[in-house]
């Protein structure tokens, strides 16, 4: 439905508060280095303009597209070239090329200072002094650090952020009330950002078909009682929502997401029995709840898949008539029967089925050719099952920190060219799969683990894409979205790697390590471990473990010393010398 003024349409649909918040998110995701005040000024100007269009849709410039309006506004920033360099060249382009140009310059790892949490009293004072600015600042800081964060979901996070301060700033023990809530929001926020980044990578790098296949599989697992036509409709709508958000069209995305939630709730009887509670909530909570809703129970007495997809004489006829529809039905039928499989496994099975039909439907006896296609699935199913079993056993034996260390060593040996901060971040996140998924029963382990690993490996892929250093990473990241994890799992030690030159500075530590949080101290130790492997890739696990224990003994000793800095200087030299002698660094 065409509107005379798109900006007026979205302003009216979303309301002023959400409109302003979404424009701020959009601008902060595009211009990640701009100061907060500059963004607020731009947002206010856009909002005032939108109001004139609401009053009169025929007013000057009100008929322009949102990309044109927003792009023109971004291009008024005076310091664009000094701050962003070649991104300023985007402003010389016309739409839609200008928006594409801005999208290409989004930085997954912007050079921004770490967010340091102020004292609780300081935060509460700031919250009470100017609640609106305080919450806008939250949106701005998250959006600029996470340029693909799912914008309507960020509004939900901001709502929870506000609720936490409203409640806790009047509590007797403000810190005890607030800090756990902020930790939870931070951890959930990082996870949400990473999940959305995979959706955007899927759409942008592998296309709409890849995303739709993922959505068919996931929604079929979640809504196994829904008809294929219903799932297909939801997939089409969901694809539109995510295409818009990933493309920077945040107003349209939020509006369409609200429409989709409304549709799902109006049609829950034909979708899922698990939606009732979600649908009683306000809009932001409702959308979030639907996105996280548990899988519905599988319908009883589902017939065997083989009848329609192997035994039927019409397989090739049905496939030829509408290939993607037939494959979509296969994926739907398989996924609704297998909530115990990861989405990526289901997609591998569908790909194997497609490849088999492509080959067999051109053969002399197609039925004879594809009769054993389901037998080809067995090794594909067993591979992640075995991997998860082995790694959960290792996790249970080692605990999270040492499990992360084992993965750090494993991945540094696979792709030693990757930067140390990236290897530490990715391996730490890979290691979290243990506490996240290994506690689940067998039926829930694979979907939890392998789909989580897909999200984490995508972080590696997007960070590596910014500064490519390893052909092996590029290959695993670009060849097949669903085979990324098996591709990385299959990598052995990189025998072509020339060990890094020894640099004593890398292994120099100071007394500041003693005042770090446990997490930060772990990161310091893990950074040293990666550097150690880069210097000595042939070191055995036992040697690395022993050197890391020496490192722990050194830190513990010096943190207890009266003159900590002198201890770190003197004992640090001894530690390096000892490690060099033992490992031949």
């Amino acid at each position: 439905d065409a509107h005379k003024s798109e900006v007026a349409h979205r302003f009216k649909d979303l309301g002023e508060e959400n409109f302003k918040a979404l424009v701020l998110i959009a601008f902060a995701q595009y211009l990640q280095q701009c100061p907060f005040e500059d963004h607020v000024k731009l947002v206010n100007e856009v909002t005032e303009f939108a109001k004139t269009c609401v009053a009169d849709e025929s007013a000057e410039n009100c008929d322009k597209s949102l990309h044109t309006l927003f792009g023109d506004k971004l291009c008024t920033v005076a310091t664009l070239r000094e701050t962003y360099g070649e991104m300023a060249d985007c402003c010389a382009k016309q739409e839609p090329e200008r928006n594409e140009c801005f999208l290409q310059h989004k930085d997954d790892n912007p050079n921004l200072p770490r967010l340091v949490r102020p004292e609780v009293d300081v935060m509460c004072t700031a919250f009470h002094d100017n609640e609106e600015t305080f919450l806008k600042k939250y949106l701005y800081e998250i959006a600029r650090r996470h340029p693909y964060f799912y914008a309507p979901e960020l509004l939900f996070f901001a709502k929870r952020y506000k609720a936490a301060f409203t409640e806790c700033c009047q509590a007797a023990d403000k810190a005890a009330c607030l800090l756990p809530k902020l930790d939870e929001l931070r951890d959930e926020g990082k996870a949400s950002s990473a999940k959305q980044r995979l959706k955007c990578a899927s759409l942008q790098k592998f296309g709409e078909r890849a995303f739709k296949a993922w959505a068919v599989a996931r929604l079929s697992q979640r809504f196994p009682k829904a008809e294929f036509a219903e799932v297909s409709k939801l997939v089409t709508d969901l694809t539109k929502v995510h295409t818009e958000c990933c493309h920077g069209d945040l107003l349209e995305c939020a509006d369409d997401r609200a429409d989709l939630a409304k549709y799902i709730c109006e049609n829950q009887d034909s979708i899922s029995s698990k939606l009732k509670e979600c649908c009683e909530k306000p809009l932001l909570e409702k959308s979030h709840c639907i996105a996280e809703v548990e899988n519905d129970e599988m319908p009883a007495d589902l017939p065997s898949l083989a009848a329609d997809f192997v035994e039927s004489k019409d397989v090739c006829k049905n496939y030829a008539e509408a290939k993607d529809v037939f494959l979509g039905m296969f994926l739907y039928e398989y996924a609704r029967r297998h909530p115990d499989y990861s989405v990526v496994l289901l997609l591998r099975l569908a790909k194997t089925y497609e490849t088999t039909l492509e080959k067999c439907c051109a053969a002399a006896d197609p039925h004879e050719c594809y009769a054993k296609v389901f037998d080809e699935f067995k090794p594909l199913v067993e591979e992640p099952q075995n991997l998860i079993k082995q790694n959960c056993e290792l996790f249970e034996q080692l605990g999270e920190y040492k499990f992360q260390n084992a993965l750090l060593v494993r991945y540094t040996k696979k792709v030693p060219q990757v930067s140390t901060p990236t290897l530490v971040e990715v391996s730490r996140n890979l290691g979290k799969v243990g506490s996240k998924c290994c506690k689940h029963p067998e039926a829930k382990r694979m979907p939890c683990a392998e789909d989580y690993l897909s999200v984490v490996l995508n972080q590696l892929c997007v960070l590596h894409e910014k500064t490519p250093v390893s052909d092996r990473v590029t290959k695993c990241c670009t060849e097949s979205l669903v085979n990324r994890r098996p591709c990385f799992s299959a990598l052995e030690v990189d025998e072509t790697y020339v060990p890094k030159e020894f640099n004593a500075e890398t292994f120099t530590f100071h007394a500041d390590i003693c005042t770090l949080s446990e997490k930060e101290r772990q990161i310091k130790k893990q950074t040293a471990l990666v550097e150690l492997v880069k210097h000595k890739p042939k070191a055995t696990k036992e040697q690395l473990k022993a050197v890391m224990d020496d490192f722990a003994a050194f830190v513990e000793k010096c943190c207890k010393a009266d003159d900590k800095e002198t201890c770190f200087a003197e004992e640090g030299k001894k530690l390096v010398a000892a490690s060099q002698a033992a490992l031949g660094l």
Epitope: D549, D550, K557, A578
Partner: nanobody
Framework: QVQLVESGGGLVQAGDSLRLSCAAS????????MGWFRQAPGKEREFVAR????????YYADSVKGRFTASRDNAKNTVYLQMNSLKPEDTAVYYC?????????????????WGQGTQVTVSS
């Protein structure tokens, strides 16, 4: 399973020297740090020395620094504690222990396997 057997303890005069040995069998010896601890009557077991897996790094309790020296021979699966300038307050049962997979390097809880101990008595 690891067996650790200490030897070399005895009764000596203040100012004398003793060399304790600890022979290991069972689990890989060379991959782990080893510790020496001691326990005087009515007191907690306390850290004396730690020697790393390769014998290239040693840490000592302040009370024994400069007088005691830990060493190891991985070929013989043995760790040593050379004790010089012994004092009456060094009197205790001395234990060697193999480092565990976690916990403090300076606390008994950070060590998994223990010997039965050897008595050292220093008379004045």
């Amino acid at each position: 399973q690891v067996q650790l057997v200490e030897s070399g303890g005895g009764l000596v005069q203040a100012g004398d020297s003793l060399r304790l040995s600890c022979a290991a069998s069972g689990r890989t010896f060379s991959g782990y740090a080893m510790g020496w601890f001691r326990q005087a009557p009515g007191k907690e077991r306390e850290f004396v020395a730690r020697i790393n897996w390769s014998g290239t790094l040693t840490y000592y309790a302040d009370s024994v620094k400069g007088r005691f020296t830990a060493s190891r021979d991985n070929a013989k699966n043995t760790v040593y504690l050379q004790m010089n300038s012994l004092k009456p307050e060094d009197t205790a049962v001395y234990y060697c222990a193999q480092r565990g997979d976690s916990g403090s390097n300076y606390d008994p809880s950070g060590y998994s396997y223990w010997g039965q101990g050897t008595q050292v008595t220093v008379s004045s």
